[in-house]
Amino acid sequence: FVRTKIDTTENLLNTEVHSSPAQRWSMQVPPEVSAEAGDAAVLPCTFTHPHRHYDGPLTAIWRAGEPYAGPQVFRCAAARGSELCQTALSLHGRFRLLGNPRRNDLSLRVERLALADDRRYFCRVEFAGDVHDRYESRHGVRLHVTAAPRIVNISVLPSPAHAFRALCTAEGEPPPALAWSGPALGNSLAAVRSPREGHGHLVTAELPALTHDGRYTCTAANSLGRSEASVYLFRFHGASGAST
């Protein structure tokens, strides 16, 4: 089968399938949709197709990550003549079709957003009646999930030569700036973005040498808010006790 896309500001949502001149395959998705973690987001997707008056069975599909090969997060099927698209798959029950595929609308609602939902999504429609054809948005819509900082781990670890170091890891989008404060410290901004694959929202800051006993506080901040957590270092008989 053959397919293309268009990048246009024209509103094709209400274009009739049987309008003249004949429609060609196209899908309209915005490059990006932004929403905050915990909220819901709508991923718009409308399409046109060349099969006039098509009323046969159809399937609407959304994938994440990659077109064609990416995992499906939503799938529904509508029987011949039906405007009801029965959900067959909704990952974690958080995906719901808002649009009506019979009216060329595959728009999807995603509930209870998490930072892990920050990826590209691709809509697809399949016709399976007298006409066998399918079309997928190859460029997709990027769902950009924002989140206030959250410190996911703070700890004190032994270092060589009976020393100690502190680690603070936080998540957020935009990635938060981390700062340490504590005894005999100013503010240390020794934050480095975690290099681990798939952890792009995690930031880690290390205090390489804790020279004084007391309370060490890690503060994470971005444009949406701030968060802080503390560890306590007490050295006695060469051992350390740390609590948050």
């Epitope: 053959v2 293309t4 246009t8 060609r24 196209s26 197709h49 064609y68 590209r120 079309y135 190859r138």
Partner: antibody
Framework: QVQLVESGGGLVQPGGSLRLSCAAS????????MTWVRQAPGKGLEWVSF????????YYADSVKGRFTISRDNSKNTLYLQMNSLRAEDTAVYYC???????????WGQGTLVTVSS | DIELTQPPSVSVAPGQTARISCSGD??????ASWYQQKPGQAPVLVIY???KRPSGIPERFSGSNSGNTATLTISGTQAEDEADYYC?????????FGGGTKLTVL
Amino acid sequence: QVQLVESGGGLVQPGGSLRLSCAASGFTFSNYWMTWVRQAPGKGLEWVSFISYSGSTTYYADSVKGRFTISRDNSKNTLYLQMNSLRAEDTAVYYCAREGTSSMFDVWGQGTLVTVSS
Amino acid sequence: DIELTQPPSVSVAPGQTARISCSGDALRSYYASWYQQKPGQAPVLVIYDDNKRPSGIPERFSGSNSGNTATLTISGTQAEDEADYYCGSYDGTVHVFGGGTKLTVL
């Protein structure tokens, strides 16, 4: 400004290998599918291969399938084409191009010449 | 696989209208794009989605697609428009170009 610059072309013997590079600048490389298109001397354009944003989806023309491998390094803003088992009919100027959201090629490099000859 | 067919050559007098056709069954359902290529240079996109013009392309370039034939029209052709023109389309896994048309401005 938006720019693509190919390199790595040259003279190679039949059966040999060559790796082409395409350095991208002036745009967010990881937001675009990329492609290689070639043009034999005095002939028309022939699409060679596509690669998706992350590199995990690739497509090839039948004429190069199994011999050529497209890849990308988004951290270096660079597209690659590894060409193995080269044949005389692979002689061409190889262009890298950016694919716009309408499945058209909106930015092209200047091309690099690959000559396969003994 | 899809195939796109173009005439090898088209001639036009300066100031006149040049029309270059591209035919193929795929064009009944899918968009065409057009590329201009001058000797020794890389191709340049002049039309996409049948009739859309990228920024920087003169208004004298226009496109249409009817039935199984896409047409590139150059109104008021100028000497600098002399070039090879290629149509293109896409089938989900491969992109195909027509054989190219050499436009000669007499």
